[in-house]
């Protein structure tokens, strides 16, 4: 029950996170005009990954897309790439995790397969979240650098009567959305990985019991199951049965997760 809850919660948290990453990527407010020196401005500038916008006091908003690819800063291109990779990985992770959910039954899918899918989606969510956090952090670093550069420029060359005020940009809402969304996706991914451990069939050193109809004696076959450590060739938690000779009327017991010996 706890495993199902952890997996379900991980899925929901990741879903919210990825929706947030998509929203942040599409948002225009990655950087907004710094209003420290002029808290009330008649023309307000803000920029996103794909276009820059100007909102006038009149209410008129004009947005212009970055129609060039080669002319854009390499850092901006890197941020775009990180966010897109994050979205793609997250989307694939969501798709995989839907099929991995314990509450959804698809054919005769084994718990081991669901465990693997849960782990895969969890890793994808973790990488997706890290991509988003990295992308937003790179952009934030770029803003901080430019902010202090423009602050330095602002106080140079003001000897004349005419002032040329340089527009400075600060953190926009999209950065905070991105950080939170990336964090949620990361948390969701960790939860999926935790759920995966609970989904994987537990390894006990079960004893295979051989029943003989004719005889009164019961023959025990010690070491009938080889305990798997999770490493080596037995990574998929498959039971390895010994190839001992059995009579036709021998009853085989396949212990499942809920069998108690």
């Amino acid at each position: 029950m706890a495993v199902t809850a952890c997996q379900g919660l991980g899925f929901v948290v990741s879903l919210i996170g990825i929706a947030g990453i998509i929203a942040a990527t599409c948002m225009d407010q990655w950087s907004t005009q710094d209003l420290y020196n002029n808290p009330v401005t008649a023309v307000f500038n803000y920029q996103g990954l794909w276009r820059s916008c100007v909102r006038e006091s009149s209410g008129f908003t004009e947005c212009r897309g970055y129609f060039t690819l080669l002319g854009l800063p390499a850092m901006l291109q890197a941020v775009r790439a990180l966010m897109i990779v994050g979205i793609v990985l997250g989307a694939i992770g969501l798709l995989v995790s839907i099929f991995a959910l314990k509450c959804i039954r698809i054919g005769s899918m084994e718990d081991s397969a669901k465990a693997n899918m849960t782990l895969t989606s969890g890793i994808m969510f973790i990488v997706s979240g890290l991509c988003a956090i990295a992308g937003v952090s790179v952009f934030a670093n770029m803003l901080v650098t430019n902010f202090w550069m423009s602050t330095a420029n602002m106080y140079t060359g003001m000897g004349g009567m005419v002032q040329t005020v340089q527009t400075r940009y600060t953190f926009g809402a999209a950065l905070f959305v991105g950080w939170v969304a990336g964090g949620l996706t990361l948390i969701g991914g960790v939860m999926m990985c935790i759920a995966c451990r609970g989904l994987a069939p537990e390894e006990t050193n079960y004893k295979a019991v051989s029943y003989h109809a004719s005889g009164h004696s019961v023959a025990y076959k010690p070491g009938g199951f080889k305990a798997s450590t999770g490493f080596g060739s037995n990574t998929k938690n498959k039971k390895i049965y010994d190839g001992g000779a059995r009579t036709e009327d021998e009853v085989q017991s396949y212990p499942s997760k809920h069998d108690y010996v």
């Epitope: 009330v40 008649a42 820059s52 100007v54 009149s58 212009r64």
Partner: antibody, heavy 118, light 113 residues
């Protein structure tokens, strides 16, 4: 067509208050910002302030802050400008104007003459 | 506050001749975000409210004759009337529409010579 119609001329005593109205028609009142500008006889134009009818946000010129109050009644598409503590130098023609893209005032009313005299 | 300075304060031009009015701002009116200059030109005839002529320094308002043109960037702007007509006799104002408070130039009185 777009029209801005103001209230009639006012004669006030120093220290009194005046409230000028500006009724808009021919467009969606809440979609445009209303600006107030005054012009003393033979003088230039002087910006008083602006109001965003949708949210009621106001911005005032520092010169008039504390003395002027801009309001809007969206139900009757009317903007108001109230100027208190009137003095003789407040004698002027008061205009309301609609703000459009480029922060330009495209439609102006005919103006309300406010005379402050003892 | 941004100070707007117009020159000349009055100008007499013959009909059919070109008229040029200058406007200088104490601060740049060029917005880096959209590369537009937030300068507006108005025409005011006696006993009438001002009329919008040009916004964004060079964009002519609809219905304004094409003899009116605006130019300039940053801090220096010009309103040009290519061929003066009798109905163009008026006072012309430039306005900072970039920052609060919106400020107007003192006006240029255009007369017929």
């Amino acid at each position: 067509q777009v029209q801005l119609v103001q209230s009639g001329a006012e004669v006030k005593k120093p220290g009194a208050s005046v409230k000028v109205s500006c009724k808009a028609s021919g467009y969606t009142f809440t979609s445009y910002v209303i600006n107030w500008v005054r012009q003393a006889t033979g003088q230039g134009l002087e910006w008083i302030g602006e109001i965003h009818p949708r949210g009621g946000n106001t911005y005032y010129s520092e010169k008039f802050r504390g003395r002027v109050t801009l309001t809007a009644d969206t139900s009757i598409s009317t903007a108001y400008m109230e100027l208190s503590s009137l003095r003789s130098e407040d004698t002027a023609v008061y205009y309301c104007a609609r703000l459009r893209r480029g922060n330009a005032m495209d439609y102006w009313d005919q103006g309300t003459t406010v005379t402050v005299s003892s | 506050d941004i100070v707007m300075t117009q020159s000349p304060s009055s100008l007499a031009v013959s009909l059919g001749e070109m008229a040029t009015i200058n406007c200088k701002s104490s601060q740049s009116l060029l917005n880096s975000g959209n590369q537009r200059n937030y300068l507006t030109w108005y025409q005011q005839k006696p006993g009438q409210p001002p009329k919008l002529l040009i916004y964004w320094a060079s964009t002519r308002e609809s219905g304004v004759p094409d003899r009116f043109s605006g130019s300039g960037s940053g801090t220096d702007f010009t309103l040009t009337i290519s061929s003066l007509q009798a109905e163009d006799v008026a006072v012309y104002y430039c306005q900072n529409s970039y920052n609060y408070p919106y400020t107007f130039g003192q006006g240029t009185k255009l007369e017929r010579k």
